[in-house]
């Protein structure tokens, strides 16, 4: 039960996180005009990964896309790449984790397969979250650097007389959305990895021996009552005593790679 809850919660948290990463990537407010200690302009500038916008005092907003690839700063391209990689990995992770969910039964999928898929999606969520956090952090660092550079030349003299209104940019809402979303995806991934341990089969690498009685048959499986190290009940060892006789092949268990986690 605890495994299902952990896995389900991990999935939901990751889903919210990935939705947040997508939202942050699409948002226009990655950097917004700094209004503190600045000449108050009647226009408000803000920029995203894909376009820059200007809002007039009337509320009229005009946005222009960056219709160039080569002309954009390498850092911006890197941030775009990190966010897209994060989204792609997260989307694949979500797809994998849906099939890995313990509460969903698809054919006769083995628990070991579900454990593998849970671990895979968990790792994908972790990497996705890290990509988003890295992307947002790179952009934030770029902003901080530019902020202090423009503060240093707040008023650049032109011909000694003319002053330039230096538009300084500060952290936009998308950065905070991205950080939170990346963190949630990361947490969700960790939860999936933890859930994977509970899903993993716990049998030891012994050949099962079948004892055939003439009357009421009982299959005895060594290690059947061994303590589970996972978070949930030992899923492979639920039915120890069964009414019908079993062949050796039926009760024989093979070690899973998760037995040694």
């Amino acid at each position: 039960m605890a495994v299902t809850a952990c896995q389900g919660l991990g999935f939901v948290v990751s889903l919210i996180g990935i939705a947040g990463i997508i939202a942050a990537t699409c948002m226009d407010q990655w950097s917004t005009q700094d209004l503190y200690n600045n000449p108050v302009t009647a226009v408000f500038n803000y920029q995203g990964l894909w376009r820059s916008c200007v809002r007039e005092s009337s509320g009229f907003t005009e946005c222009r896309g960056y219709f160039t690839l080569l002309g954009l700063p390498a850092m911006l391209q890197a941030v775009r790449a990190l966010m897209i990689v994060g989204i792609v990995l997260g989307a694949i992770g979500l797809l994998v984790s849906i099939f890995a969910l313990k509460c969903i039964r698809i054919g006769s999928m083995e628990d070991s397969a579900k454990a593998n898929m849970t671990l895979t999606s968990g790792i994908m969520f972790i990497v996705s979250g890290l990509c988003a956090i890295a992307g947002v952090s790179v952009f934030a660092n770029m902003l901080v650097t530019n902020f202090w550079m423009s503060t240093a030349n707040m008023y650049t003299g032109m011909g000694g007389m003319v002053q330039t209104v230096q538009t300084r940019y500060t952290f936009g809402a998308a950065l905070f959305v991205g950080w939170v979303a990346g963190g949630l995806t990361l947490i969700g991934g960790v939860m999936m990895c933890i859930a994977c341990r509970g899903l993993a089969p716990e049998e030891t690498n012994y050949k099962a021996v079948s004892y055939h009685a003439s009357g009421h048959s009982v299959a005895y499986k060594p290690g059947g009552f061994k303590a589970s190290t996972g978070f949930g009940s030992n899923t492979k060892n639920k039915k120890i005593y069964d009414g019908g006789a079993r062949t050796e092949d039926e009760v024989q268990s093979y070690p899973s790679k998760h037995d040694y986690v």
Partner: antibody
Framework: QVQLQQPGAELVKPGASVKVSCKAS????????MHWVKKRPGQGLEWIGG????????NYNHKFKGKATLTVDKASSTAYMQLSSLTSEDSAVYYC????????????WGQGTVVTVSA | DIVMTQSPSSLTVTAGEKVTMNCKSN????????????VTWYQQKPGQPPKLLIF???TRESGVPDRFTGSGSETDFTLIISSVQAEDLAVYYC?????????FGSGTKLEIK
């Protein structure tokens, strides 16, 4: 077509206050900024300040802070400018002007109110 | 505050002539976000309120005759009337509508011979 109606003239005594009105018709009043501009004989135009009726957000020229108070009555689509502690320096034509939607320029102007400060 | 300096303060021309008036600001009025210059030109005829002619330094307001042309960038702006008509007798003001407080130039008075 947007129209801004202002009273033609106001005669006030020094030290007194006056409240100039500007009634808008033919547009969504709350959407656009309403600005006030002062014009003294033989001098240029001076921006006093602006108010956004939607949220009563104001912007004042620091030179007129304490002198002018901008308010709006959304129900009657009317903007008001109160001028206090009047002196002869305040004798001028006061225009209300509605901001454009697409830019910060003043697209529509009232005919102006002549404020005369005289004992 | 941004200071808008207009020149000349007045000029007298004959109908059909080309007129150029200048406006200089002590601070750049170019917004880097959209590469627009926030300068507006108004025409004030005697006994009338000002009328919007040109915004964003070069965009003509609807209904304004195409003989009026605005140009310039950052700190230097120009209003050109390609062929002056008798009805163009007025005072022309440039305005900073970028940085608060909005400021106007002292005006250029256009007189017709």
């Amino acid at each position: 077509q947007v129209q801004l109606q202002q009273p033609g003239a106001e005669l006030v005594k020094p030290g007194a206050s006056v409240k100039v009105s500007c009634k808008a018709s033919g547009s969504t009043f709350t959407t656009y900024w309403m600005h006030w501009v002062k014009k003294r004989p033989g001098q240029g135009l001076e921006w006093i300040g602006g108010i956004r009726p939607f949220d009563s957000n104001t912007n004042y020229n620091h030179k007129f802070k304490g002198k002018a108070t901008l308010t709006v009555d959304k129900a009657s689509s009317t903007a008001y400018m109160q001028l206090s502690s009047l002196t002869s320096e305040d004798s001028a034509v006061y225009y209300c002007a509605m901001g454009a939607y697409y830019s910060n320029s003043f697209a529509y102007w009232g005919q102006g109110t002549v404020v005369t400060v005289s004992a | 505050d941004i200071v808008m300096t207009q020149s000349p303060s007045s000029l007298t021309v004959t109908a059909g002539e080309k007129v150029t008036m200048n406006c200089k600001s002590n601070q750049s009025l170019l917004n880097s976000g959209n590469q627009k210059n926030y300068v507006t030109w108004y025409q004030q005829k005697p006994g009338q309120p000002p009328k919007l002619l040109i915004f964003w330094a070069s965009t003509r307001e609807s209904g304004v005759p195409d003989r009026f042309t605005g140009s310039g960038s950052e700190t230097d702006f120009t209003l050109i009337i390609s062929s002056v008509q008798a009805e163009d007798l007025a005072v022309y003001y440039c305005q900073n509508d970028y940085v608060y407080p909005f400021t106007f130039g002292s005006g250029t008075k256009l007189e017709i011979k």
